[in-house]
Each structure stands twice: as structure tokens, then as C-alpha cells.
């Protein structure tokens, strides 16, 4: 085809499994969006492989991804965010595998941050608060958050609470006294946009008071 790339030597390219997955992050760097793709098989030889996205872009028909170690990504303002794009793995001009994807359906929010827990003695509860950069965004504003907490000694016994706000109250009586707890939070798009859970926030650790013997309540 006129003007297009010359293809290199395909060798055994057809024998490999080039399945891949991608996620988008909108307004991740000011008004810039990002798209990150990676092969599902970590052993794929990526030496001469490139990713390309075509369609649902502004200004250009297609864009090449940048490769960084084993991931491929684009950071740009030029995603139209309407309709589907075609993302292909290429060797030269030959497409090895392609996926038609609407970038608004593979959104991975940024991880929540500034997670903290404050004990209210009078109310006998713990107020959990955290922040999210998405409150300031134009596109992915509405999120569902998953707060997970566990007693530190219980390796895999997490309790999960889903909420749409950035504040949660945990009742003291629901927690073990004089125990160390770990808590963390992640987010997922919850309105119009679809996609994946964010990374977990850094964990926050807090200790519950001991039981006050006279009242039967925790200190």
C-alpha cells in the first residue's frame, strides 16, 4: 500500500501466541491520556514487535506505541474517546494480531492516596478517609471504591466494603480490641466508563484500643 512501512523478516512470527491486553488512563498527566499494552505471555520475544493504534484518533490516522522493557504505551491528548480503535501487534507492515477496543471501556483509574484512619473516642468508631485524583478530572469522575481491611495476623482474611464516597466509618465493636489492622483502597470506573480496578493505595496501619474492663468497652 502506498506510503506504508516495508515489512521485515517474519521468521517464525506466526507460530507464537501474541495475545495481549491493554488499559487506558484518562487525564493521567494533565490533559494527556495514556494507553498501556502488554503481551499476556511474558516469554514472547518482542525484539521486532511493535504496537500500533488506528482509528478514533484526532490529527493522525495511526500512532505507534513506545516500548519500555516489556510494556508498550502511548501518552497523548489525541484519543477521540468516541468509537473503537484498532490495536495491532505488527512486524514491519504485517499485523500479527489485532483487537478492536473502545478506550472508554478499558479504563484503569489512578490509585487512591492519602489513606488515613482516625479513632473517635466519643463515637466509638474509626473514620477512614482517602483521596483520589479523579475528583478533579473531566472524564472519569465517578468511581466505586473498594476498601479492604484485615487484622495483621490474618494473612488472607480481608473484609471488603464498597462505597462511592471517599469516607467510611468502621464501628469499633466490629473490630477486635488491641489489634493491629492493615487497610487499603482501590477504585474502578462506575459511570459511563468501564474498565479495571486501579492499583491498591499504599496500606495504612492502625491499632484498636484495648477493652476498658469497667465498661466493657475499648480504651
Amino acid at each position: 500500500e502506498s506510503g506504508y512501512a516495508q515489512n521485515g523478516d517474519l521468521e517464525d512470527a506466526e507460530l507464537d501466541d501474541y495475545s495481549f491486553s491493554c488499559y487506558s488512563q484518562l487525564e493521567v498527566n494533565g490533559s494527556q491520556h495514556s494507553l498501556t499494552c502488554a503481551f499476556e505471555d511474558p516469554d514472547v520475544n518482542t525484539t521486532n514487535l511493535e504496537f500500533e493504534i488506528c482509528g478514533a484518533l484526532v490529527e493522525v490516522k495511526c500512532l505507534n506505541f513506545r516500548k519500555l522493557q516489556e510494556i508498550y504505551f502511548i501518552e497523548t491528548k489525541k484519543f477521540l474517546l468516541i468509537g473503537k480503535s484498532n490495536i495491532c501487534v505488527k512486524v514491519g507492515e504485517k499485523s500479527l494480531t489485532c483487537k478492536k477496543i473502545d478506550l472508554t471501556t478499558i479504563v484503569k483509574p489512578e490509585a487512591p492516596f492519602d489513606l488515613s484512619v482516625i479513632y473517635r473516642e466519643g463515637a466509638n468508631d474509626f473514620v477512614v478517609t482517602f483521596n483520589t485524583s479523579h475528583l478533579q478530572k473531566k472524564y472519569v469522575k465517578v468511581l466505586m471504591h473498594d476498601v479492604a481491611y484485615r487484622q495483621e495476623k490474618d494473612e488472607n482474611k480481608w473484609t471488603h466494603v464498597n462505597l462511592s464516597s471517599t469516607k467510611l466509618t468502621l464501628l469499633q465493636r466490629k473490630l477486635q480490641p488491641a489489634a493491629m489492622y492493615e487497610i487499603k483502597v482501590r477504585s474502578i470506573p462506575d459511570h459511563y466508563f468501564k474498565g479495571f480496578w486501579s492499583e491498591w493505595s499504599p496500606s495504612y496501619y492502625f491499632r484498636t484500643p484495648e477493652i476498658n474492663n469497667s465498661s466493657g468497652e475499648m480504651d
Epitope: 506504508y4 512501512a5 521486532n48 490529527e59 500512532l63 513506545r66 507492515e93
Partner: antibody, heavy 122, light 107 residues
Framework: QVQLVESGGGLVKPGGSLRLSCAVS????????MAWVRQAPGKGLEWVAT????????YYPDSVKGRFTISRDDAKNSLYLQMNSLRAEDTAVYYC???????????????WGQGTLVTVSS | EIVMTQSPATLSVSPGERATLSCRTS??????LAWYQQKPGQAPRLLVY???SLHIGIPARFSGSGSGTEYTLTISSLQSEDFAVYFC?????????FGGGTKVEIK
Amino acid sequence: QVQLVESGGGLVKPGGSLRLSCAVSGFTLSDYYMAWVRQAPGKGLEWVATISASGLRTYYPDSVKGRFTISRDDAKNSLYLQMNSLRAEDTAVYYCARPMSAHYGFNYFDYWGQGTLVTVSS
Amino acid sequence: EIVMTQSPATLSVSPGERATLSCRTSEDIYNGLAWYQQKPGQAPRLLVYSANSLHIGIPARFSGSGSGTEYTLTISSLQSEDFAVYFCQQYYDYPLAFGGGTKVEIK
């Protein structure tokens, strides 16, 4: 600052070959797509070739496809244009050009070399 | 292949006047358009990209506009240093293409 310096131009007979070089400085060559653009005497600009930042993909118009080859050596901070089977209509000033935007393929050019003249004549 | 048509080929304008240069494309290029200025013996100089974004260091008297297949470069008040040849370029798709150029000359 960013600099692009072309060399290798000259007089060549029809059917002959020439290799142009572009020495770059002031930026990381491996971050950028690079291109060659030519201008025949008294005429407009014509895009000749583009190479992707990785060097894995090359793009040409029909007028030079199969005759010209763009390549790069990032370690030497150099871009090349190998021109074979030259014709009289290839006579032009050849410019090396760098896109403003790194990495992805937005091909508008904010830095240009001073150009090198290629004359194809018997 | 996208064909670029610039008009007029020559534009005679007095200093201080407004100049309007046109660039038409054979198909929608979704704002993937740049404008360049070229003076004799010099390489082209980027003025505008994304159809309407002014390149750094370019005077505010230059402006780009348009969408779809119709684009315009406007010089609001021509200065002596603005008399030159102007080219539009589409970068929406390969093969990249330049217009034939508009020569802005002193009236």
C-alpha cells in the same frame, strides 16, 4: 541546541547512487521519528521518507519506493538516505527533518537541516 | 492518497494589511495540518500545527483555523519579514503531503 547537518549531496549520473547523511545533536535521536524532505529547484516541498523511532518501520511515497532506503544509527547520532537508480526528477535540495513530538508519529517538523543539493544529470 | 491544494498561488499584500491563505485537502484530515514559512535559501520554519496551535516563538499575528478539509492561515498585519512562501502539510496519514505553496509578496 538542536542541530541537523546534512552531507553527501553532489552530482550523479542518471541510474547512479548516492548516500546522504544527517548528523544530529542536541536531542536523543532514539526518541524521535525522523524524515527526509526534498525541494526541487524553484518548486514546492516533497516528503521522501520517514523512519520510526525504533527503526523498525519505514515509510515512502510511491515516487521513491523501491529506490530509496532510510536508515538510522542512533549510536552515531546519524540518519541516512540511500538513493539508488537516480533520475533527473530526483534533483533537489534534500532536508533532514525532526518531528516536534517524540515517539509516536506526529509528523510535523520543527527542526530542519540546512539541506544538501543532489543533482542528477548526465 | 491525500491531495493538498493551496490558494492563491501568489498573494500581493501591502505591509500592515491582513493576509488569508487557504489550504484544501481531498479528504478529512481531522486537524492533522501544519503550516510552514520558507524564505529564499532557507529551510522551512514551522508556524502552526494541529491546524490552530501556534508553535513556540511564532508571533501572535499568525493564526491557524479550520477543520475537516478546509484550513486557513491568517497573518493579521503583515510585517516586512513575513513576505515569503507558505506551505501547508497534512500529517494525518501516509504518504505525508505538502501543498504547492502560496507566495506572499509586497503589493
